[in-house]
Interface confidence: low
């Protein structure tokens, strides 16, 4: 439906508060280095302009596209070239090239200081002094650090953030009330950002068809009682929402997401029996709840898939008539029967089925050729099952920290060219799969583990894309979205790697390590472990374990010493010498 003024349309649909919040997120995700005050000024200007268009849709410039209006506004920033360098060249382009240019300059790892949490009293005072500015600052800081964060979901996080401060700043023990809530929001926020980053990568690097296939599989698992036509409609709408958000069209995205939630709730009888509670919630909570809703029960009397997809004489005819529809139905039917499979496994099975039909439908006897296609699925299913079984056993044996260390060693040996901070971050997240998924029963382990690993490996891919250093990483990241995890699993030690020169400075520690949180201390030790492996890629597990045990003892001893700094200096030298000897450096 065409509107005379797109900006007026979105302002009216979303309301002033959401409009301003979404424009702030959009601007912060594009210009990640700009000060908060500059963004607020730009947002206020856009908002005032939108209000004039609401009053009179025929007013000057009100007919311009949102990209034109927002791009023009971003290009008024005086320090664009000094701050962003070549991104300033985007402003010489016309839409839609200008917006594409801004999108290409989004930085997944911006050079921004770590967010340090102030004292609780300081935060509560700031909250009470100016609640609106306090919450805007939250949106700004998250959006600029996570330029692909799902904008309507960030509004939901901000609502919870506000609720936490409203409740806890009045509590007797403010810190006890607030800090766990903030930790939870931080961890959930990081997870949400990473999940959305995979959706955007899927759309941008592999195209709409890849995203739609993912969505068909996931929604079919979640809504196994919904018929194919219903799932197809949801997939089409969901694809539009994510395409918009990933493309920086945040107002349209939030508006369309609200429409989709409304549609789902109005049609829940033909979608899922699990939606009732979600649909009673306010909009932001409703949309979040729907996105996280548990899988509905599978219908009891589903027929065998073989009849329609293997035994039928019409398989090639049906496939030829509408290839993607037929494959979509196959994926839907397989997925709704297998909530115990990961989405990526289901997509591998569908790809195998497609490849078989492409080959067999051109053969002399197609049926004879594809008759055993389901047998080809067995090894594809068993591979992740076995991998998860082995790794969960290892996790249960080692615990999370040591399991992360095992993965650090494994991945550093596979791709030693990758930067140490990236290897630490990615391996720590890979290691979290243990506590996240191994507690689940068999039927839930694979979808939990393998789909989570897809999200984490995508982090590696997007970070590596910014500064490519390893052909092996590039190959695994770009060849096939659904085979990324098997591709990385299949990598062996990189025999071509020339070990890094030994640098004693890398292994020099100071008393400040003693005041770090347990998590920060782990990261320091894990950073040292990666560096050790880079120096000695052929070191055995036993050698590395001995060095790490010595290192842990050294930190513990010096943190208890009266003169910590001297202890770190003297004992550190001894540790480095002993480690060199142990590893033959």
């Amino acid at each position: 439906d065409a509107h005379k003024s797109e900006v007026a349309h979105r302002f009216k649909d979303l309301g002033e508060e959401n409009f301003k919040a979404l424009v702030l997120i959009a601007f912060a995700q594009y210009l990640q280095q700009c000060p908060f005050e500059d963004h607020v000024k730009l947002v206020n200007e856009v908002t005032e302009f939108a209000k004039t268009c609401v009053a009179d849709e025929s007013a000057e410039n009100c007919d311009k596209s949102l990209h034109t209006l927002f791009g023009d506004k971003l290009c008024t920033v005086a320090t664009l070239r000094e701050t962003y360098g070549e991104m300033a060249d985007c402003c010489a382009k016309q839409e839609p090239e200008r917006n594409e240019c801004f999108l290409q300059h989004k930085d997944d790892n911006p050079n921004l200081p770590r967010l340090v949490r102030p004292e609780v009293d300081v935060m509560c005072t700031a909250f009470h002094d100016n609640e609106e500015t306090f919450l805007k600052k939250y949106l700004y800081e998250i959006a600029r650090r996570h330029p692909y964060f799902y904008a309507p979901e960030l509004l939901f996080f901000a609502k919870r953030y506000k609720a936490a401060f409203t409740e806890c700043c009045q509590a007797a023990d403010k810190a006890a009330c607030l800090l766990p809530k903030l930790d939870e929001l931080r961890d959930e926020g990081k997870a949400s950002s990473a999940k959305q980053r995979l959706k955007c990568a899927s759309l941008q690097k592999f195209g709409e068809r890849a995203f739609k296939a993912w969505a068909v599989a996931r929604l079919s698992q979640r809504f196994p009682k919904a018929e194919f036509a219903e799932v197809s409609k949801l997939v089409t709408d969901l694809t539009k929402v994510h395409t918009e958000c990933c493309h920086g069209d945040l107002l349209e995205c939030a508006d369309d997401r609200a429409d989709l939630a409304k549609y789902i709730c109005e049609n829940q009888d033909s979608i899922s029996s699990k939606l009732k509670e979600c649909c009673e919630k306010p909009l932001l909570e409703k949309s979040h709840c729907i996105a996280e809703v548990e899988n509905d029960e599978m219908p009891a009397d589903l027929p065998s898939l073989a009849a329609d997809f293997v035994e039928s004489k019409d398989v090639c005819k049906n496939y030829a008539e509408a290839k993607d529809v037929f494959l979509g139905m196959f994926l839907y039917e397989y997925a709704r029967r297998h909530p115990d499979y990961s989405v990526v496994l289901l997509l591998r099975l569908a790809k195998t089925y497609e490849t078989t039909l492409e080959k067999c439908c051109a053969a002399a006897d197609p049926h004879e050729c594809y008759a055993k296609v389901f047998d080809e699925f067995k090894p594809l299913v068993e591979e992740p099952q076995n991998l998860i079984k082995q790794n969960c056993e290892l996790f249960e044996q080692l615990g999370e920290y040591k399991f992360q260390n095992a993965l650090l060693v494994r991945y550093t040996k596979k791709v030693p060219q990758v930067s140490t901070p990236t290897l630490v971050e990615v391996s720590r997240n890979l290691g979290k799969v243990g506590s996240k998924c191994c507690k689940h029963p068999e039927a839930k382990r694979m979808p939990c583990a393998e789909d989570y690993l897809s999200v984490v490996l995508n982090q590696l891919c997007v970070l590596h894309e910014k500064t490519p250093v390893s052909d092996r990483v590039t190959k695994c990241c770009t060849e096939s979205l659904v085979n990324r995890r098997p591709c990385f699993s299949a990598l062996e030690v990189d025999e071509t790697y020339v070990p890094k020169e030994f640098n004693a400075e890398t292994f020099t520690f100071h008393a400040d390590i003693c005041t770090l949180s347990e998590k920060e201390r782990q990261i320091k030790k894990q950073t040292a472990l990666v560096e050790l492996v880079k120096h000695k890629p052929k070191a055995t597990k036993e050698q590395l374990k001995a060095v790490m045990d010595d290192f842990a003892a050294f930190v513990e001893k010096c943190c208890k010493a009266d003169d910590k700094e001297t202890c770190f200096a003297e004992e550190g030298k001894k540790l480095v010498a002993a480690s060199q000897a142990a590893l033959g450096l």
Epitope: P224, F228, A229, S232, P299, P303
Partner: nanobody
Framework: EVQLVESGGGLVQPEGSLRLSCRAS????????MGWYRQPPGKEREFVAR??????HYADSVKGRFTISRDNAKNTVYLQMNSLKPEDTAVYYC?????????WGEGTLVTVSS
Amino acid sequence: EVQLVESGGGLVQPEGSLRLSCRASGSIFSINTMGWYRQPPGKEREFVARIYPGITHYADSVKGRFTISRDNAKNTVYLQMNSLKPEDTAVYYCFYYYDDRNYWGEGTLVTVSS
């Protein structure tokens, strides 16, 4: 191409029963939705019932009185209509959904009258 042929319509007394059949031929597979719509005299076509593996849906006006079923081996869908009322009088159309469109039969007339 898909062809659908309905049968089983006719004249029946109020509170009586009828069983409609619809046989599909052509490019058919059992996992697709099949079902029934009807068009009362002088009114728009309206949804009656549909069936999908493991799932059935009914219009509120027929719930508890009509039962849809399917025989995949015969590519046939049935509509068992009990406790018929005069307002059930209509041409009943069978449909089959594939590739984002519905295929329709020619229709069979059901008249409920004393």
